[in-house]
């Protein structure tokens, strides 16, 4: 069980960079974040909305906190989830 | 090029049920949130209802919930919305739209008439 | 009674430059991206600015938007025959759990 969090960890936070990539490379990551995002009510993988870097500038929808009831927080002058997604990811894999 | 397709609307009397329909193509459509807005005759635009890619989360205007249900097959492309106990304040175009955070794509929309 | 205030209504003469205001509060878009949309007679919206400022693609650089504190504006410049149109600010309300629009203001060119 330890060896596989750490590896679901080292994986998630390596990752991470893909968020603030601008390349057609990196899209496909970026999108299933985003799709996960919007389900989970959680924002970014380790550092919450900075994991995206300059695409928070020009999406800040990314992240947008939706539900007044869940924990949310002004980032660059937009009010986005709290939550980071790591802890939502990795239930969702240890259920699945 | 995506595309929306909106069906269902027509004449309804006040009370009764209608079920809009939304095709979608163009698109990798269980990828995006998806919205209902409407525009009574010679209004503005309202926000009806929004549904997210995996259908967890639902968003409702207040003047339409407890009224009205969204939902989504993604393996049919296709976006509903389903009204109950429908009132003359309901008549308007509806609009299937991509996203909620913006609308980036629009539907031509479909009239729905509420009357006795 | 629209969350989001805009003019009724705007005109300006080809080649002129018109702005279109839209007043919010700290909920909505103090707090949240604002987004324009386009609405051509007899026609479905379209999506014209979004996060304030951005352009999708193709649309003219004519339009621009811009947002400081509470309050946003679209500004149109070379105003042409083919930009009348009534036009719409929105933005998602987290006091309301909505997304609000303006009452949309009509441009006469």
């Known amino acids: 069980k330890s060896k596989s969090d750490r590896i679901v960890n080292e994986t998630l936070y390596e990752n991470t960079k893909l968020l603030s990539a601008t390349g057609e490379s990196e899209k496909q990551f970026q999108e299933a974040i985003i799709v996960f995002q919007e389900e989970f009510k959680c924002c970014g993988l380790v550092n919450g909305a900075a994991d995206w870097g300059n695409n928070f500038q020009h999406y800040p929808e990314l992240c947008a906190c939706l539900d007044k009831q869940r924990p949310c927080q002004s980032y660059n002058g937009k009010q986005v989830y709290k939550e980071t997604c790591i802890s939502f990811i990795k239930d969702f894999l240890a259920k699945n | 090029e995506v595309q929306l397709l909106e069906s269902g609307g027509g004449l309804v009397q006040p009370g009764g049920s209608l079920r809009l329909s939304c095709a979608a193509s163009?698109?990798?459509?269980?990828?995006?949130?998806m919205s209902w807005v409407r525009q009574a005759p010679g209004k503005g635009l309202e926000w009806v209802s929004a549904i997210s890619p995996g259908s967890s989360n639902t968003y409702y205007a207040d003047s339409v919930k407890g009224r009205f249900t969204i939902s989504r097959d993604n393996s049919k492309n296709t976006l509903y919305l389903q009204m109950n106990s429908l009132r003359a304040e309901d008549t308007a175009v509806y609009y299937c739209?991509?996203?909620?955070?913006?609308?980036?794509?629009w539907g031509q929309g479909t009239l729905v008439t509420v009357s006795s | 009674q629209s969350v989001l205030t805009q003019p009724p209504s705007a005109s300006g003469t080809p080649g002129q430059r018109v702005t279109i205001s839209c007043s919010g509060s700290s909920s909505n878009i103090g707090n949240n991206s604002v987004y324009w949309y386009q609405q051509l007679p007899g026609t479905a919206p379209k999506l014209l600015i979004y996060s304030d400022s951005q352009r999708p693609s193709g649309v003219p650089d004519r339009f621009s938007g811009s947002k400081s504190g509470t309050s946003a504006s679209l500004a149109i410049s070379g105003l042409r025959s083919e930009d009348e149109a009534d036009y719409y600010c929105?933005?998602?309300?987290?006091?309301?759990?909505?997304?609000?629009f303006g009452g949309g203001t009509k441009l006469t060119v």
């Open positions: 163009g698109f990798t459509f269980s990828s995006y949130s």
């Open positions: 739209a991509r996203k909620h955070m913006p609308f980036d794509y």
């Open positions: 929105g933005t998602w309300d987290y006091s309301l759990n909505g997304y609000v």
